[in-house]
Every structure is written in structure tokens, then in C-alpha cells.
């Protein structure tokens, strides 16, 4: 039950995270005009990964796409790549994890297969989250560098007669969305990896076999090292064996150490 909950929660958290990464990637407010200590401009500038926008005080907003590929800064291209890789990995991870969910039965898929799929999706979510966090952090670092450069210019470039309004950019809402979303995807991935441990059978490729002893009955379960003898311990008529060999799937399972997370 705990494994299912952990897996389900990991899936939901990752889903929210990836939705956030997609939202952040599409958002226009990666960098916004710094209004602190600036004259009250009747124009507000903000930029995204794909276009830059200007919101006039009149209420009209005009956005222009970056229609060049070669003319863009390498850092911006790198951020775009990281975010897209994060989205693609996250989307594949979501697809894989849907089939890996314990609460969903697909044919006669074994727990070992579900465990492997859960681990795969978990790793994908972790990498996806790291890509998003890295992308947002690279962009943030770029902003900080440019901010201090333009601040220096504001105080050194005042030699001329004509003053110029120095537009400085600060962190936009998309950066915070990206950081949170990346973190959620990462947490979701870790939860999936933890759930995977609980899904994996402790011993595979062995059958649980009941052996008939002539004097008294002993039910031997490989791996568990638990034997129940017939000497008075079955006073309440508990069924220890029914004469045949059963697989681990068919036998009522004992709580394993991985069930409590």
C-alpha cells in the first residue's frame, strides 16, 4: 500500500513539475525591466526565451519573436536546449510511469517489469528536473552578470550631455516557476526511485514450494527463512499449505522491508 502511495504521489508531483517546466519555457517573463531606483517609465520591457515584449503604460502590449537563430547569444540557445531536453525527458518519463503504476493492470505484466519501468521514469524525472534547474540557473546567472555590468555603465557613462535611460533587467516570474517546477520534478523522480525498491521482488526466478514431511507438516518458504511446524501451532485451523507448489505472486505475501517507506 505504501509503495503504491509513494509511486502515485511521485507521479503526481512529477506531472505538476513537468507542467510547470512547460509553462516556464513558454512564459515571456524570464527577465523583466528593473523598476527599482529607475525613473517612472511609461514603457515596461520583459523578455522570454522565444520573444521580447513591451507593455506600454497605455495598456497595449507588443511582442516580437526572435526570428534569428544564429544571431542569438549562445547562452540563450543553451537555456532553450536544456529546457526542451527537460520537457522531452519528462514527457517520456510520464508516459513510462503511467504503465508502471501499480494501480494500473496491463495484461500480465510482472512486478519486476513495473519496477524497472518505475526506476526508468524516476531517473528520467530526476534528469528532467536537473535540466530545468540548470537552464533557469544559467539564465539567472546571465541576468546577474548583465545587471551589474549595466549598473556600472550607469555610473561611468554619464560624461555626455544627453542622458540615456539604462534599461536593466531582473528576475522574471518564469525563473521562479522554473526553479519550483524543476524541484518538484526532481522530488517526484526520487519518489519513483524509492517506490521502485518496494516493487521489486526480493528473490526472483524461484518458486515457493511446499514440502510434505511424513511425521509432521512443514511449510518452507525460500528467502523468508520462516518455517511453521505442525506441532500445536495451528490450533485455529490456519491453512499452512494446500499440497501444491505456488509462485510468489499467488501466495499471500508477507510484508517486506520495502513496504514501509
Amino acid at each position: 500500500m505504501a509503495v503504491t502511495a509513494c509511486q502515485g504521489l511521485g507521479f503526481v508531483v512529477s506531472l505538476i513539475g513537468i507542467a510547470g517546466i512547460i509553462a516556464a519555457t513558454c512564459m515571456d517573463q524570464w527577465s523583466t525591466q528593473d523598476l527599482y531606483n529607475n525613473p517612472v517609465t511609461a514603457v515596461f520591457n520583459y523578455q522570454g526565451l522565444w520573444r521580447s515584449c513591451v507593455r506600454e503604460s497605455s495598456g497595449f502590449t507588443e511582442c516580437r519573436g526572435y526570428f534569428t537563430l544564429l544571431g542569438l547569444p549562445a547562452m540563450l540557445q543553451a537555456v532553450r536546449a536544456l529546457m526542451i531536453v527537460g520537457i522531452v525527458l519528462g514527457a517520456i518519463g510520464l508516459l513510462v510511469s503511467i504503465f508502471a503504476l501499480k494501480c494500473i493492470r496491463i495484461g500480465s505484466m510482472e512486478d519486476s517489469a513495473k519496477a524497472n519501468m518505475t526506476l526508468t521514469s524516476g531517473i528520467m524525472f530526476i534528469v528532467s528536473g536537473l535540466c530545468a534547474i540548470a537552464g533557469v540557473s544559467v539564465f539567472a546567472n546571465m541576468l546577474v552578470t548583465n545587471f551589474w555590468m549595466s549598473t556600472a555603465n550607469m555610473y561611468t557613462g554619464m560624461g555626455g550631455m544627453v542622458q540615456t535611460v539604462q534599461t536593466r533587467y531582473t528576475f522574471g516570474a518564469a525563473l521562479f516557476v522554473g526553479w519550483v517546477a524543476g524541484g518538484l520534478t526532481l522530488i517526484g523522480g526520487v519518489m519513483m526511485c524509492i517506490a521502485c525498491r518496494g516493487l521489486a521482488p526480493e528473490e526472483t526466478n524461484y518458486k515457493a514450494v511446499s514440502y510434505h514431511a511424513s511425521g509432521h507438516s512443514v511449510a518452507y518458504k525460500p528467502g523468508g527463512f520462516k518455517a511453521s511446524t505442525g506441532f500445536g501451532s495451528n490450533t485455529k485451523n490456519k491453512k499452512i499449505y494446500d499440497g501444491g507448489a505456488r509462485t510468489e505472486d499467488e501466495v499471500q505475501s508477507y510484508p517486506s522491508k520495502h513496504d514501509y517507506v
Partner: antibody, heavy 118, light 113 residues
Framework: DVQLVESGGGLVQPGGSRKLSCAAS????????MHWVRQAPEKGLEWVAY????????YYADTVKGRFTISRDNPKNTLFLQMTSLRSEDTAMYFC???????????WGQGTLVTVSA | DIVMTQSPSSLTVTTGEKVSMSCKSS????????????LTWYQQKPGQPPKLLIY???TRESGVPDRFTGSGSGTDFTLTISSVQAEDLAVYYC?????????FGAGTKLELK
């Protein structure tokens, strides 16, 4: 057709108060920022105040800050300018204007004359 | 505050003549975000409210005759009337639309010779 009609002007004593109104029609008033601009007799244009479509932010010229208050009633399609502590230099024709692309004023009212005199 | 300086203060012209007037701002009105200069030109005839002619320094408002042309960027701007008509006799104002307060120039009066 866009129409802006100012009212409320007249003769006021120095230190007195007056409230100007601007009735808008022919456009979605609640979607546009609005301004008050004044023009002293035989003088140039002077920007007075701005109010955004949602009533925030609001900006004033330094010459009227603390004395004039701009407001709007979107359901009634009306812009207001409450003027207090009036001085003789506030004597002017007061125009309301609609904010447009390029932060320009595309439509102006005919104006209402405010005369501050003893 | 941004100071807008218009020159000349008055111009005497004959109909059909080409005329230019200047407007200079104390600070750049150029916005890098959209590569536009936030300067507007208005025409005001006696007893009338101002009329919008040009915004973004060079974009003509709809309905404005194409003999009116705005040019310039940053701090130096020009309004040109390619062939002055009798109905163009008015006062022309430039306005800073970039930084509050949105200041106006003192105006250039166009008069008939």
C-alpha cells in the same frame, strides 16, 4: 464614434475646490488609460495626471501633486479630476484624453475652462 | 523631468512649400525593447483640442495625410510637411511619451506669409 465631453469648469476663488468630469462614449472606457491635460490661455500644453484602466497606477505632474486627485467610474464611463487649493496659475482649459498606441493621446475632449480669480 | 525643446518657435511659409520643424529631448526617448522612440506630434488649430498626427516618432495616425512625415530617433526628431496646405496652419507640439511626467514642447506655430 469616440466622444469625450468635459464639464465642471467655471470661476473659482483662490484656495477653492472644483471637480471636473469627462463623460466618455463610443468605446470600451474600462479598457483604456485616461489623462488630464491643461492649456493656460495663449500658452502651450501641460500634462496634469494619468489614471490606468484599472485605477492603478496613477501619476501626477509635480505642479499638482497633493492638490489634484484623478479618479474614474468605469461602470458610468466617467473620468474625474478633483482640484483643491486652487491657485491663479491653475487657470486653464482642461482637456481629458484617451491613451493609445505609442503612449499617445488619440482622442481629446473639447475642454472645460477653469478660471481661478478673486 | 525630460525637457522638450522645439525650434523654431514660429515658421512663416507659403502654400506648397516644404517645411521642417525640430524637437529635441534632454534624454533619449528610445526604447531598446521594441526599437522605438516614444515621441508624439500633435497639431492644434485655434479654438480646437490637439489632434494626434504621429506616434512612435514616425508612425502616422490613420486619417492623417501622407504629406506629414515624422523622423528621428533617440533625442533628435523632425516633423516634415512636404507641401503645406492652408488647413495645415496651426501650432505643432511634440511630446515625450517615454518617462513620466509626459512633457510637451513649447510648440512651433506655422503661419502663412
Amino acid at each position: 464614434d469616440v466622444q469625450l465631453v468635459e464639464s465642471g469648469g467655471g470661476l473659482v476663488q483662490p484656495g477653492g475646490s472644483r471637480k471636473l468630469s469627462c463623460a466618455a462614449s463610443g468605446f470600451t472606457f474600462s479598457s483604456f488609460g485616461m489623462h488630464w491635460v491643461r492649456q493656460a490661455p495663449e500658452k502651450g500644453l501641460e500634462w496634469v495626471a494619468y489614471i490606468s484602466s484599472g485605477s492603478s497606477p496613477i501619476y501626477y505632474a509635480d505642479t499638482v501633486k497633493g492638490r489634484f486627485t484623478i479618479s474614474r467610474d468605469n461602470p458610468k464611463n466617467t473620468l474625474f479630476l478633483q482640484m483643491t487649493s486652487l491657485r491663479s496659475e491653475d487657470t486653464a482649459m482642461y482637456f481629458c484624453a484617451r491613451f493609445y498606441y505609442g503612449n499617445s493621446f488619440d482622442h481629446w475632449g473639447q475642454g472645460t475652462l477653469v478660471t481661478v480669480s478673486a | 523631468d525630460i525637457v522638450m525643446t522645439q525650434s523654431p518657435s514660429s515658421l512663416t511659409v507659403t502654400t506648397g512649400e516644404k517645411v521642417s520643424m525640430s524637437c529635441k529631448s534632454s534624454q533619449s526617448l528610445f526604447n531598446r525593447g521594441n526599437q522605438k522612440s516614444y515621441l508624439t506630434w500633435y497639431q492644434q488649430k485655434p479654438g480646437q483640442p490637439p489632434k494626434l498626427l504621429i506616434y512612435w516618432a514616425s508612425t502616422r495616425e490613420s486619417g492623417v495625410p501622407d504629406r506629414f512625415t515624422g523622423s528621428g530617433s533617440g533625442t533628435d526628431f523632425t516633423l516634415t510637411i512636404s507641401s503645406v496646405q492652408a488647413e495645415d496652419l496651426a501650432v505643432y507640439y511634440c511630446q515625450n511619451n517615454y518617462i513620466y511626467p509626459l512633457t510637451f514642447g513649447a510648440g512651433t506655430k506655422l503661419e502663412l506669409k
